[in-house]
Interface confidence: low
């Protein structure tokens, strides 16, 4: 059975957290970062579909970077393999409406993190 | 306390348009997504899709694609609904409802009071 | 799209009675994440539809605990352990999986 600390939501085998307030994307994975975490890193379609469902109206900063003209990676430094298109030019990628799109780095937005589930 | 009040009743011809109108309050408006969902006299409910108030971004059952168009003001948190090229058969009560955002996106948890939306030559 | 079909259509009990409305869709409604978006709506006449169940059996705040609903993959059940006289309108089942949401013909509960 997944454990998840209190405010975290578990799905597969991970926990998520679900950011009420706004930061840019680097404060962003700051946050994660103090809590034992990174941006979320969406490893499946189904994972994919569960983000979208569960985040509501606002779009979610995710785990996803690229330096100009450079592939996608996540926070782990993994390259992305392309399971699902990112819209936009910017060089980080959040969850909107409809799927994965891109900004520029300096924009606010909620965030989503992500690290593995607790088995007790 | 939370409520949407709808736009009042309206009779058309067939051919034009009508704009539907819902106002939120109690809550905040860009924080839930908003549903159409109508009903012909004496008969069941049909769900025509979903804005969100946040992004302005759309869903529309396929059925209602082309002839509908879902819009926001946030500044007046007010949703709209526009039905184009209306026929007899849409004459029916347009409702608006809201969805909790979180794992119960999907479901209405407050419905407005209805629009008749009566179509007739 | 899903067909949601609701049995009976009309359905007629005594005050105190037990009442049992079927809903059956024609795929399964567990959603990727798991969760199962089946929900109950009852409509008064001239009122708006209020949600009683959503998730298949999770009650609404304010839904009076006679009302339950269950079920899984396609078959759905609301039950009334006792109707009262507030209770006579028509019931929807609702599917929230698959896309576009689609809603049950809808049951007509009257008192005998």
């Known amino acids: 059975q997944a454990a998840c600390p209190e405010s975290w939501i578990g799905f597969q085998r991970k926990c998520f957290y679900f950011s009420d307030d706004t930061k840019n994307w680097t404060s962003s994975q700051r946050f994660c970062d103090s809590q034992d975490a990174d941006l979320a890193q969406v490893e499946s379609f189904q994972e994919l579909n569960f983000l979208l469902r569960y985040k509501g109206p606002s779009d979610h900063w995710i785990g996803l970077s690229r330096e100009q003209g450079q592939p996608w990676k996540w926070i782990n430094g993994t390259e992305w393999t392309r399971q699902f298109p990112i819209l936009g030019a910017g060089e980080c990628a959040y969850l909107n409406d409809k799927g994965a799109s891109s900004a520029r780095h300096y924009t606010e937005r909620k965030w989503i993190c992500s690290k593995s589930d607790i088995h007790v | 306390q939370v409520q949407l009040v709808q736009s009042g009743a309206e009779v058309k011809k067939p051919g034009a348009s009508v704009k539907v109108s819902c106002k939120a309050s109690?809550?905040?408006?860009?924080?839930?997504?908003m549903h159409w969902v109508r009903q012909a006299p004496g008969q069941g409910l049909e769900w025509m899709g979903w804005i969100n108030p946040n992004s302005g971004g759309t869903n529309y059952a396929q059925k209602f694609q082309g002839r509908v168009t879902m819009t926001r003001d946030t500044s007046i948190s007010t949703a709209y609904m526009e039905l184009s090229r209306l026929r007899s058969d849409d004459t029916a009560v347009y409702y608006c409802a809201f969805a909790q955002p979180g794992a119960e996106t999907l479901n209405f948890d407050l419905w407005g009071r209805g629009t008749l939306v009566t179509v007739s030559s | 799209d899903v067909v949601m079909t609701q049995s009976p259509l009309s359905l007629p009990v005594s005050l105190g009675q037990p009442a049992s409305i079927s809903c059956r869709s024609n795929?399964?409604?567990?959603?990727?994440?798991?969760?199962?978006?089946l929900n109950w709506f009852q409509q008064r006449a001239g009122q708006s539809p209020r949600r009683l169940v959503y998730?298949?059996?999770n009650r609404d705040s304010g839904v009076p605990d006679r009302f339950s609903g269950s079920g899984s993959g396609t078959d759905f059940t609301l039950r009334i352990s006792r109707v009262e006289a507030e209770d006579v309108g028509v019931y929807y089942c609702m599917q929230g999986t698959h896309w576009p949401y689609t809603f049950g013909q809808g049951t007509k509960l009257e008192i005998k």
């Open positions: 998730k298949v059996s």
């Open positions: 109690g809550y905040t408006f860009t924080g839930y997504y």
């Open positions: 795929q399964s409604l567990v959603y990727s994440d798991g969760g199962t978006y």
